[in-house]
Interface confidence: medium
């Protein structure tokens, strides 16, 4: 996971950061650009049909530390990366799906405890 450009210096992050957004664009966004006081993110996750869908957007400063932490979710494959170093920095983020569990390659029903 990347959180490039993070710094303890208060001047390191611009007051308003512009991010590329797709499927997470607020109503007031223009040309697929949103603005935030927090982070830009790009996320890859399997949709309900197992297709690896990429979305991107803005995260507010409040709570973004937690959201940018890639905590595994049971039975869901997803990965998120965040950045703050420049406008539209999330264009260059490239999160990758965590590997499939071996049980997905065994014929027969799955039994969850």
């Amino acid at each position: 996971k990347k959180e490039d450009g993070e710094s303890t210096a208060p001047t390191a992050r611009p007051k308003v950061l512009r991010c590329k957004c797709h499927h997470h664009c607020p109503e007031d966004s223009v040309n697929n650009i949103c603005s935030t006081d927090g982070y830009c993110f790009t996320m890859i996750e399997e949709d309900d049909s197992g297709t690896p869908v990429v979305t991107s957007g803005c995260l507010g400063l409040e709570g973004s530390d937690f959201q940018c932490r890639d905590t595994p979710i049971p039975h869901q494959r997803r990965s998120i990366e965040c950045c703050t170093e420049r406008n539209e920095c999330n264009k260059d983020l490239h999160p990758t799906l965590p590997p499939l569990k071996d049980r997905d390659f065994v014929d027969g029903p799955i039994h969850h405890k």
């Epitope: 797709h22 869908v53 799906l97 499939l100 997905d104 014929d107 029903p109 799955i110």
Partner: antibody
Framework: QVQLQQPGAELVKPGASVKLSCKAS????????MHWVKQRPGRGLEWIGR????????KYNEKFKSKATLTVDKPSSTACMQLSSLTSEDSAVYYC?????????WGTGTTVTVSS | DIVMTQSQKFMSTSVGDRVSVTCKAS??????VFWYQQKPGQSPKALIY???YRYSGVPDRFTGSGSGTDFTLTISNVQSEDLADYFC?????????FGDGTKLELR
């Protein structure tokens, strides 16, 4: 190894129906959705629809809603597509394709020929 | 429906060349694009997902790029086994739609 096996060819008469099969092996059948794609020579690829083998839930391309019916048989790990009221426009190669994240596997394809 | 346009139906190349196959979406699809390779008499084979992610086992001479509406599949150091049809597909919204394909031929 993930594999999708399809019969090589089907010859059917105009107006008739045909049921195409796609047998999956090498993975847990119910965890990967199955897509169906049509290919005619010089006409590129067309997405027909997809089915969730676990629930049987389907999503169709409007264009094929009255033409194709997708089903699954879980015990045999087989997905099926029934094509109805066949015309020469339905003569094509039909592929099943299974996708899960960074795995993407296509069947061998069934050539359907509609001819009297 | 989203239309995927591959304006070049044929592209001529030589072994060792670098070639770029392009695909244009009729509306913004983010990076939700697949690239497929198809050889005569064979099923399509997935090369790239999410516009730039290479499937495992795909040689690193295949590179996908682009976002929004413009996408490119670049093959550097073309090999004779790369001569095939290449299709893009968007999966940002239903129905999923494909480009008409670009045939890569030997010059």
């Amino acid at each position: 190894q993930v594999q999708l096996q399809q019969p090589g060819a089907e010859l059917v008469k105009p107006g008739a129906s045909v049921k195409l099969s796609c047998k999956a092996s090498g993975y847990t059948f119910t965890t990967y959705w199955m897509h169906w794609v049509k290919q005619r020579p010089g006409r590129g690829l067309e997405w027909i629809g997809r089915i969730d083998p676990n629930s049987g839930g389907t999503k169709y391309n409007e264009k094929f809603k009255s033409k194709a019916t997708l089903t699954v048989d879980k015990p045999s790990s087989t997905a099926c597509m029934q094509l109805s009221s066949l015309t020469s426009e339905d003569s094509a190669v039909y592929y099943c394709a299974s996708r899960r994240g960074d795995i993407d596997v296509w069947g061998t394809g069934t050539t359907v020929t509609v001819s009297s | 429906d989203i239309v995927m346009t591959q304006s070049q139906k044929f592209m001529s190349t030589s072994v060792g060349d670098r070639v770029s196959v392009t695909c244009k979406a009729s509306q913004n699809v983010g990076t939700n694009v697949f690239w497929y390779q198809q050889k005569p008499g064979q099923s399509p084979k997935a090369l790239i997902y999410a516009a730039s992610y290479r499937y495992s086992g795909v040689p690193d001479r295949f590179t996908g790029s682009g976002s929004g509406t413009d996408f490119t599949l670049t093959i550097s150091n073309v090999q004779s086994e790369d001569l095939a049809d290449y299709f893009c597909q968007q999966y940002d919204s239903y129905p999923l739609t494909f480009g008409d394909g670009t045939k890569l031929e030997l010059r």
